[in-house]
Interface confidence: medium
């Protein structure tokens, strides 16, 4: 989890801190959304279950040239134990359903808030 602290944390951070910072970043994205996020780019929907961090990263990594989600992509990579590259897909993707990045972020945020409340930090 070393990279999860962004610029504020030079070394490894506790999972609870990492998850909170990810949530704060997603909140920030939804708050500051003036124009359509990432120009309305569509991404594969995912099942919000075990392994969802890698699945979320696999979806979002296919969005290029969108600075608004770059920090989120970096943070998600800290939660995913393996390297993720564009075009990679797991069974957690709902392959027949694409949604806008903005909706994807809102859905992910809602789920992460629930996990945080329940103390599921890993």
């Amino acid at each position: 989890l070393t990279c999860l602290g962004g610029f504020a944390s030079p070394g490894p951070v506790p999972p609870s801190t990492a998850l909170r910072e990810l949530i704060e970043e997603l909140v920030n994205i939804t708050q500051n959304q003036k124009a359509p996020l990432c120009n309305g780019s569509m991404v594969w929907s995912i099942n919000l279950t075990a392994g969802m961090y890698c699945a979320a990263l696999e979806s979002l990594i296919n969005v290029s040239g969108c600075s608004a989600i770059e920090k989120t992509q970096r943070m998600l990579s800290g939660f995913c134990p393996h390297k993720v590259s564009a075009g990679q897909f797991s069974s957690l993707h709902v392959r027949d359903t694409k949604i806008e990045v903005a909706q994807f972020v809102k859905d992910l945020l809602l789920h992460l808030k629930k996990l945080f409340r329940e103390g599921q930090f890993n």
């Epitope: 909170r20 909140v27 945080f116």
Partner: antibody, heavy 121, light 107 residues
Framework: EVQLVESGGGLVKPGGSLRLSCAAS????????MNWVRQAPGKGLEWVSY????????YYADSVKGRFTISRDNAKNSLYLQMNSLRAEDTAVYYC??????????????WGQGTMVTVSS | DIQMTQSPSSLSASVGDRVTITCRAS??????LGWYQQKPGKAPKRLIY???SLQSGVPSRFSGSGSGTEFTLTISSLQPEDFATYYC?????????FGPGTRVDIK
């Protein structure tokens, strides 16, 4: 005991400045987002500003944007509100309030006792 | 901005009465809603968080329900110490907004 204690309130003339402080104790201050909330005499509650745990995310109510600045010093377990260009309508009791786990999650679980700010000539 | 409306604005009740206060949000806020009790000259005290979770130390006669846009605070059997003003708060998105409050006084 988990506690928040505000200070710095007082009487100030319109256009003047004031700096409020909120001292936190009994919990790991750096792990919590913080807010300022105010209440004008005889009125309801109004959220004023929010600051995240590591300073990166800050939000303000439109009514104070450009005039108030929220900040925190995690080393001193303290939250601040710098209030400039004060107006009569800023007269209120100012409370600091903790976010239970940050990032809008289960907000405002702990409140201070409040500090009164009066803006009058 | 999300607007919060509360009803009724005030009510008179007797000890032992069941009291219900409603809060409506102008758009969906999930369960990002809290209920607060405030007595004159005191800071607000949280009763309910996440729309329906009871704050530790708060008597079980208080309960919350709802999600999305409509929420309810219920006091199953009003006690003398419950006479106060009650506020709802949405913390789903900034600016956070409080309801205008419901004053509960003695009939």
């Amino acid at each position: 005991e988990v506690q928040l204690v505000e200070s710095g309130g007082g009487l100030v003339k319109p256009g003047g400045s004031l700096r409020l402080s909120c001292a936190a104790s009994g919990f790991t201050f750096s792990s919590y987002s913080m807010n300022w909330v105010r209440q004008a005499p005889g009125k309801g509650l109004e959220w004023v500003s929010y600051i995240s745990t590591s300073y990166n995310y800050i939000y303000y109510a439109d009514s104070v944007k450009g005039r108030f600045t929220i900040s925190r010093d995690n080393a001193k377990n303290s939250l601040y509100l710098q209030m400039n260009s004060l107006r009569a309508e800023d007269t209120a009791v100012y409370y600091c309030a903790r976010d239970q786990v940050g990032a809008t999650l289960d907000a405002f679980d702990i409140w201070g006792q409040g500090t009164m700010v009066t803006v009058s000539s | 901005d999300i607007q919060m409306t509360q009803s009724p604005s005030s009510l008179s009740a007797s000890v032992g009465d069941r009291v219900t206060i409603t809060c409506r949000a102008s758009q969906g806020i999930g369960d990002d809603l809290g209920w607060y009790q405030q007595k004159p000259g005191k800071a607000p005290k949280r009763l309910i968080y996440a729309a329906s979770s009871l704050q530790s130390g708060v008597p079980s006669r208080f309960s919350g329900s709802g999600s999305g846009t409509e929420f309810t605070l219920t006091i199953s059997s009003l006690q003398p110490e419950d006479f106060a003003t009650y506020y709802c708060l949405q913390h789903n998105s900034y600016p956070f907004t409080f309801g205008p409050g419901t004053r509960v006084d003695i009939k």
